[in-house]
């Protein structure tokens, strides 16, 4: 059984205020069973950016159809970027658990920074 790897290919992503940013994340295995969530930052202060299972995240769309059984692409797009969106974004795999899912593995992170001034 292949060990799960979380791949975030870009270390740095330069974005423009007002535009859409695409944050890439792919996994190398479908196991263990459980969701992939996106966070900005690490530790207890991290911000939840996207959770497929619950919540409403109006500025976030997924690149792939996460409902497909064999999907391994958990990349997201964040629209209408502002200066307050800068930071390092992590895709994090959770293992299905009861009563709560358990964090299993995190990607290495992609730092989002402003690459152009707003017009």
């Amino acid at each position: 059984e292949e060990e799960l790897q979380m791949i975030q290919p870009e270390k740095l992503l330069l974005v423009t205020v007002g535009k859409t940013a695409t944050l890439h994340c792919t996994v190398t295995s479908l196991l263990p069973v459980g969701p992939v969530l996106w966070f900005r930052g690490v530790g207890p202060g991290r911000e939840l950016i996207y959770n497929q299972k619950e919540g409403h995240f109006p500025r976030v769309t997924t690149v792939s159809d996460l409902t497909k059984r064999n999907n391994m692409d958990f990349s997201i797009r964040i629209s209408s970027i502002t200066p307050a969106d800068v930071g390092t974004y992590y895709c994090v795999k959770f293992r299905k658990g009861s009563p709560e899912n358990v964090e299993f593995k995190s990607g290495p992170g992609t730092e989002m920074a402003l690459g152009a001034k707003p017009s």
């Epitope: 007002g18 930052g41 202060g45 939840l48 919540g55 209408s80 307050a84």
Partner: antibody
Framework: VQLVESGGGVVRPGESLRLSCAAS????????MNWVRQAPGEGLEWVSR????????DYAESVKGRFTISRDNSENTLYLQMNSLRAEDTAVYYC????????????WGLGALVTVSS | ETVLTQSPATLSVSPGERATLSCRAS??????LAWHQQKPGQAPRLLIY???NRATGIPDRFSGSGSGTDFTLTISSLQTEDSAVYYC??????????FGGGTKVEIK
């Protein structure tokens, strides 16, 4: 979406008070939450914010070191612990849900009146 | 720190007429501006977000425009129930979140 504040009242300067905000009708643990206050006859002043998981907090300079925001995601409840209260803290305190992690306030509670008077 | 200045402080308009409220930011806030309505003795209510988008359940007589530093809230045909204080809020730079000082709309 419903947000209901409680815990307001009359206290003397230097005393403490804890406000609660019971949330329902949405996935509470997925959203950042805020406290906003309004002094009598005045405008709106943002007080504090807490991120969805509860580990990240921000405060207005006017309350930093005296107020503590917290949340219990298992109970769908937001709190504001207010210590060393001053007369200028007298206000209606509203809890407000944030639209996303970096957004405006899309739902407001009805407010809790805090009066600090000797 | 971004400062929001609302004008006029008070606006007196006859029923059925147009009301135009202004909010000016001290630096660009892109389109990240919301408008909230607060009726006497009530909590604020979201009207407009991202400068131009009406919130759920808001009548279409309310519209928002502008970007950068200058924003306008327009009530196309004022109703008696629109008597309230209107606040703008920016969420481009934070913390802190900032509100304007408010515009009180009175019915003539």
């Amino acid at each position: 979406v419903q947000l209901v504040e409680s815990g307001g009242g009359v206290v003397r300067p230097g005393e403490s008070l804890r406000l609660s905000c019971a949330a329902s009708g949405f996935s509470f643990s997925s959203y950042a939450m805020n406290w906003v206050r309004q002094a009598p006859g005045e405008g709106l002043e943002w007080v504090s914010r807490i991120n969805s998981g509860g580990g990240g907090t921000d405060y207005a300079e006017s309350v930093k070191g005296r107020f503590t925001i917290s949340r219990d995601n298992s109970e769908n409840t937001l709190y504001l612990q207010m210590n060393s209260l001053r007369a200028e803290d007298t206000a209606v305190y509203y809890c407000a849900k944030q639209y996303d992690w970096n957004g405006f306030f899309d739902y407001w509670g009805l407010g809790a009146l805090v009066t600090v008077s000797s | 720190e971004t400062v929001l200045t609302q004008s006029p402080a008070t606006l007196s308009v006859s029923p059925g007429e147009r009301a135009t409220l202004s909010c000016r930011a001290s630096q660009t806030v892109g389109s990240k501006l919301a408008w909230h309505q607060q009726k006497p003795g009530q909590a604020p209510r979201l009207l407009i977000y991202d400068a131009t988008n009406r919130a759920t359940g808001i009548p279409d007589r309310f519209s928002g425009s502008g970007s950068g530093t200058d924003f306008t809230l327009t009530i196309s045909s004022l109703q008696t129930e629109d008597s309230a204080v209107y606040y703008c809020q920016q969420y481009y730079y934070w913390p802190p979140y900032r509100f304007g000082g408010g515009t009180k709309v009175e019915i003539k």
